[in-house]
């Protein structure tokens, strides 16, 4: 999916009032010293597409954090305020249900959403020019 | 605990430069943006510039453009503003401040360091 | 660049009172909007980011409102820590300007 149709002011409306929140949530009880942000972006859309990625895709020692409260949230602004994006989830959803697991709190996953708020982080900045 | 502590007051001559500490502590430093502010005697907040303490990309008002230089050091978890060709009016109380978790603003501020310009 | 006009430039009021102060933006900011109250000799403190999402530990009786434009900072019923200083900064595009400020002080 392109995210550059998207509405970011709106995604961004969204994130800080409840997803940020929920993410929070979820990494509490660790340190903020714990992580470096390792995964990056460059402009809202990358932003999108790697958040896109570290929520919705399983990785080895996170097997799926799409059933977290924050996840369902994501996915649920990125359907109201992108076009064509719920459309393009439906396969994915359906092969979701299909490997749903018990949820489990690893260091991994936590490590991955730790790196979802810095791209989040970056998604909402302010654009940064040079003068 | 957050922290950012700043260096100490600071009195220089006009024409002269200035190099103003900020050490940060109890977050991970790389991930997160550094801003500089200042405040002259019974003014308001002036935006000077932000800093990327990762990449070491900097941001800068036009005001200040090509007399402030900010600066971050990773191993110290420290960042620097140097300002050159001091004159009075650059009398003020310096700070920095560390970005939020959420990108939207900047949450914890050093206790500022005051800055005297005088001949 | 984008410029921040607060107003009023000073407010008296008592403990208790309900007290608005505004935010304007010479253009359109959506809700990229920052609030801070400064205290004397001390350096400032975050309140509202996003325009209306309280800062952690900030009293429920300030709230803030508003996009686009037109911003405003409400404190339901002043307490005696209230008097003080209060900015807007926006957070949309560098620079990021603040506004001129307003002084709260005890009628």
């Known amino acids: 999916y392109d995210f550059t149709n998207c509405d970011f002011e709106k995604i961004k409306a969204a994130y800080l009032s409840t997803i940020s929140k929920d993410l929070i949530t979820y990494m509490s009880g660790t340190k903020s010293t714990e992580f470096n942000n390792t995964v990056s972006c460059s402009n809202r859309p990358h932003c999108l597409t790697e958040i896109q990625s570290l929520t919705f895709n399983p990785t080895a020692g996170c097997a799926s954090l799409a059933k977290e409260m924050f996840a369902m949230k994501t996915k649920a602004a990125l359907a109201i305020w992108c076009p064509g994006y719920s459309e393009t989830q439906i396969n994915a959803t359906q092969a979701m249900k299909k490997r749903r697991k018990r949820k489990v709190t690893t260091n991994k996953c936590l490590e991955q959403v730790s790196q979802l708020q810095g791209l989040w982080r970056r998604f909402n900045r302010p654009l940064l020019k040079q003068q | 605990q957050v922290q950012l502590v700043q260096s100490g007051a600071e009195v220089k001559k006009p024409g002269a430069s200035v190099k103003v500490s900020c050490k940060a502590s109890g977050y991970a430093f790389t991930n997160y943006l550094i801003e500089w502010v200042r405040q002259a005697p019974g003014q308001g907040l002036e935006w000077m510039g932000i800093?990327?303490?990762?990449?070491?990309?900097?941001y800068y008002a036009q005001k200040f453009q090509g007399r402030v230089t900010l600066t971050a050091d990773k191993s110290t978890s420290t960042a620097y503003m140097e300002l050159s060709s001091l004159r009075s009016e650059d009398s003020a109380v310096y700070y920095c401040?560390?970005?939020?978790?959420?990108?939207?603003?900047?949450?914890?501020w050093g206790q500022g360091t005051t800055l005297t310009v005088s001949s | 660049d984008i410029q921040m006009t607060q107003s009023p430039s000073s407010l008296s009021a008592s403990v208790g009172d309900r007290v608005t102060i505004t935010c304007r933006a010479s253009e359109n900011i959506y809700s990229n909007l920052v609030w801070y109250q400064q205290k004397p000799g001390k350096a400032p403190q975050l309140l509202v980011y996003?325009?209306?999402n309280l800062a952690d530990g900030v009293p429920s009786r300030f709230s803030g409102s508003g996009s686009g434009t037109q911003f405003s900072l409400t404190i339901s019923s002043l307490q005696p820590e209230d008097f003080a200083t209060y900015y807007c900064q926006h957070f949309y595009e560098t620079p990021l300007t603040f506004g001129t400020g307003t002084k709260l002080e005890i009628k």
């Open positions: 401040a560390k970005e939020s978790l959420t990108g939207s603003s900047y949450d914890y």
């Open positions: 996003g325009a209306r």
């Open positions: 800093i990327n303490p990762e990449s070491g990309d900097t």
